[in-house]
């Protein structure tokens, strides 16, 4: 999946159903959601809160998806539900927890399958903070690469986040990937839900730092779809 830069976290081609025609540059999109860890979702926490009504996945937290609470329930009544872990049944990518995606009806680990696709942010989006890109956590980092490769500083070429120093992730910048800062509390983040109609995210942001999740700002709940703002917030 090195359609990207050198350090070691490139953007990969999205499977045709999500990313468009295979073979076209447009089929390669931004990176995977959240911090991807080989063993699952290391920083995932479960908040105790009232069910939040929603119309689409983007209105829910990183570890949630929007659906009817009962199977075959009224489609008009939807709430944010906890994401589904690895090996659980799914119908779409958004149902699976960060670090996983829906393949053949089952949530499988992006970590093992190198799925790093997102089509969330359009190329015209321009919020204030440095347009970091997100790339999945370095998966399958070999012993040799750990031993022999110095970690890249901000701006360094990378293929995966393990190529970057602590506090940085490997994220897309235009058509290659570079090390960018992991997002801090209050910084604008990108909700990584896949919506095929959106443009390529050529300025990926990193994921939110430890203890933070990318959630819609409270005062933006009533805003129109186009102006929803997500920021890194404490769990």
């Amino acid at each position: 999946t090195l359609n990207s830069v050198l350090n070691s976290n490139a953007i990969k081609n999205l499977p045709p159903p999500l990313g468009g025609a295979a073979g076209h540059p447009g089929s390669a999109v931004s990176a995977a959601p959240g911090i991807l860890y080989p063993g699952g979702n290391k920083y995932q926490t479960i908040d105790n809160y009232q069910p939040y009504p929603c119309a689409e996945d983007e209105e829910c937290g990183t570890d949630e998806y929007c659906a009817s609470p009962t199977r075959g329930g009224d489609a008009g009544v939807q709430i944010c539900l906890a994401c589904r872990k690895r090996r659980k049944r799914c119908m779409r990518h958004a149902m699976c927890c960060p670090g996983n995606y829906c393949k053949n009806g089952i949530c499988v680990s992006s970590d093992q399958n190198h799925f790093r696709g997102e089509i969330e942010e359009t190329i015209t989006e321009s919020f204030g903070n440095d347009h970091s890109t997100l790339d999945g956590y370095s998966r399958r980092t070999t012993l040799s690469s750990k031993m022999y490769h110095t970690k890249g500083q901000e701006g360094s070429v990378c293929l995966r986040s393990s190529d970057c120093a602590s506090g940085l992730c490997c994220a897309r910048h235009f058509w290659s990937k570079i090390c960018k800062p992991v997002l801090k509390e209050g910084q604008v983040c990108t909700k990584h839900r896949r919506k095929g109609s959106h443009g390529l995210e050529i300025f990926q942001r990193c994921y939110c730092g430890e203890g933070l999740s990318c959630r819609i700002q409270k005062d933006h709940h009533q805003a129109s779809n186009s102006s929803r703002l997500h920021t890194c917030q404490r769990h």
Epitope: T1, L2, N3, L6, P25, H114, V157, S176, I178
Partner: antibody, heavy 117, light 107 residues
Amino acid sequence: EVQLLQSAAEVKRPGESLRISCKTSGYSFTENTMHWVRQMPGKELEWMGGINPHKGGTSYNQKFKGHVTISVDKSSSTAYLQWSSLKASDAAMYYCARDWLGAMDYWGQGTLVTVSS
Amino acid sequence: DIVLTQSPASLAVSPGQRATITCITSTDIDDDMNWYQQKPGQPPKLLISEGNTLRPGVPARFSSSGSGTDFTLTINPVEANDTANYYCLQSDNLPYTFGQGTKLEIK
């Protein structure tokens, strides 16, 4: 049309310095990482390293780190590969190659470097 | 570093026949494999990029398959101007590494 035009062949002696160039056109130079690849006579290709012109960040193959330096001049959309002290074993064909989402899609025509005493 | 073992080192195929080149990686790289063609005196040309994606302008005679550690480049049918060296390149993990190359000759 994307083009990568490399500097002419060089004949050098061991211990001499050298800088070869790769002038690009037809695309926005700062939007793609530039790689350098070595091909010794009759041998396979070896990735030496790359640079992202946006902030000048580099990554090197450990095999070449410390022996070569990769740089760019954004004003002229040119990438450089340089040696401060050449060795006989540096004799090879050197290619610059543009990164496109991980793959090296456009290549320069190559610069042949001969190092002989 | 990820080691790419390419085979055969050389092969000769008659026009109209099928040529198959394999590349085995020392570790799982998902589908982050690229294939290049290099003719004498020329730089490599990208044929197929990650995800077994045929590059624009490359004839459909070229195809690739594989994921994980085993990858195959197939040329079917082979034509006279396919004489060249073919290389695999993994773009999964730094440093990028290439296979040793396969020399394809047309009988």
